[in-house]
């Protein structure tokens, strides 16, 4: 059985100032079992943007219903895009594991870039 | 507004054991990398520890071992635990917000350690 | 471990002028170094990081340059608010995040 794929098809994503934007992941399989985690960048201080298992992420909408059986994208959108929001965005899946879960796979990551609002 | 208190410093003897408090406050604490950052009298800074998002730590090898790093998300707190003080670990002891680019863009007033006989 | 030396120690300018120290790396770090301001009593500031990005509300007289390993930070017109001391640090993706020496700059 094929190990599961973290799968981030765009490398980079441009929204003007006050949009949406729409993060894309999916993966390529249901096993293991585990939630999955949005972060802004990739090293110790990585920030949490979303999180399936719990947290309050007012910005932050998932794009097809998590909770569904046989649910495979875990794209999100954030609403309100502003300068400050630029970056690198990892879809990161983990693995259930007692008493913390465990990161099991990163996406390669989709850069986030703000234009100026259109005058 | 960010803010971060720090508490639990004081004088103690050597061998002794301390553990500091930060309150953090004006930012969703859970979403946040945090981290301990020390100054010895009349010195430079010096980078203690870190604890991310997902509960992973990480020390400075003059502490490992000795110091513990937790946060209590639920009471948008931080911790560290220190064990066997020296009279080395005689600073004043930051708390700083963690950026996604690794650095620490707010920072605690500090609280004052003391380690003597 | 990356150790981050700074020069010079002690900077003696006369306000209005203009201030530039360095910071050196022992090994690559990309652009990733930070800068940051400290008065006496209080809390480090952060001014600059990936080299050259001005941190939120810091005024633009403050700039910040890379060449290889070696970092500079400039401060075009000292003000009297500028006389602090200046410490380095490298902020790679894992720690440990060393920081330099100090930079103390004081008025001429």
């Known amino acids: 059985e094929d190990e599961l794929q973290v799968i981030q098809p765009e490398k980079s994503v441009s929204v003007a100032a006050g949009e949406s934007a729409t993060l894309r992941c999916a993966m390529t399989s249901l096993i293991p079992v585990g939630p999955i985690m949005w972060f802004r960048g990739a090293g110790a201080g990585r920030e949490l943007i979303y999180n399936q298992k719990e947290g309050h992420f007012p910005r932050v909408t998932t794009v097809s219903e998590l909770t569904k059986r046989n649910n495979l994208d875990f794209s999100i959108s954030i609403s309100n895009i502003t300068p400050a929001d630029a970056g690198t965005y990892y879809c990161v899946k983990f693995r259930k594991g007692s008493p913390d879960d465990v990161e099991f796979k990163s996406g390669a990551g989709t850069e986030l870039s703000v234009r100026a609002k259109p005058s | 507004d960010v803010q971060l208190v720090e508490s639990g410093g004081g004088l103690v003897r050597p061998g002794e054991s301390l553990r500091l408090s930060c309150a953090a406050s004006?930012?969703?604490?859970?979403?946040?990398?945090v981290t301990w950052v020390r100054q010895a009298p009349g010195e430079g800074l010096e980078w203690v520890s870190l604890?991310?998002?997902?509960?992973?730590?990480y020390y400075a090898d003059s502490v490992k071992g000795r110091f513990t790093i937790s946060r209590d998300n639920s009471k948008s707190t931080l911790y560290l635990q220190m064990n066997g003080l020296r009279a080395e670990d005689t600073a004043v002891y930051y708390c700083?917000?963690?950026?996604?680019?690794?650095?620490?863009?707010?920072w605690g007033l500090g609280t004052l350690v003391t380690v003597s006989s | 471990e990356i150790v981050l030396t700074q020069s010079p120690g002690t900077l003696s300018v006369s306000p209005g002028e203009r201030a530039t120290f360095s910071c050196r790396a022992s090994?690559?770090?990309?652009?990733?170094l930070a800068w940051y301001q400290q008065k006496p009593g209080q809390a480090p500031r952060l001014l600059i990081y990936?080299?050259?990005t001005r941190a939120t509300g810091i005024p633009a007289r403050f700039s910040g340059s890379r060449s290889g390993t070696e970092f500079t930070l400039t401060i075009s017109s000292l003000q009297s608010e500028d006389f602090a001391v200046y410490y380095c640090?490298?902020?790679?993706?894992?720690?440990?995040?060393?920081f330099g020496g100090g930079t103390k700059v004081e008025i001429k």
């Open positions: 700083a917000k963690v950026t996604w680019k690794n650095v620490f863009d707010y």
């Open positions: 004006g930012f969703t604490f859970t979403n946040y990398a």
């Open positions: 604890i991310s998002v997902t509960g992973t730590t």
């Open positions: 090994q690559t770090v990309g652009s990733k």
């Open positions: 990936d080299a050259n």
């Open positions: 640090q490298q902020h790679t993706d894992w720690p440990p995040y060393t």
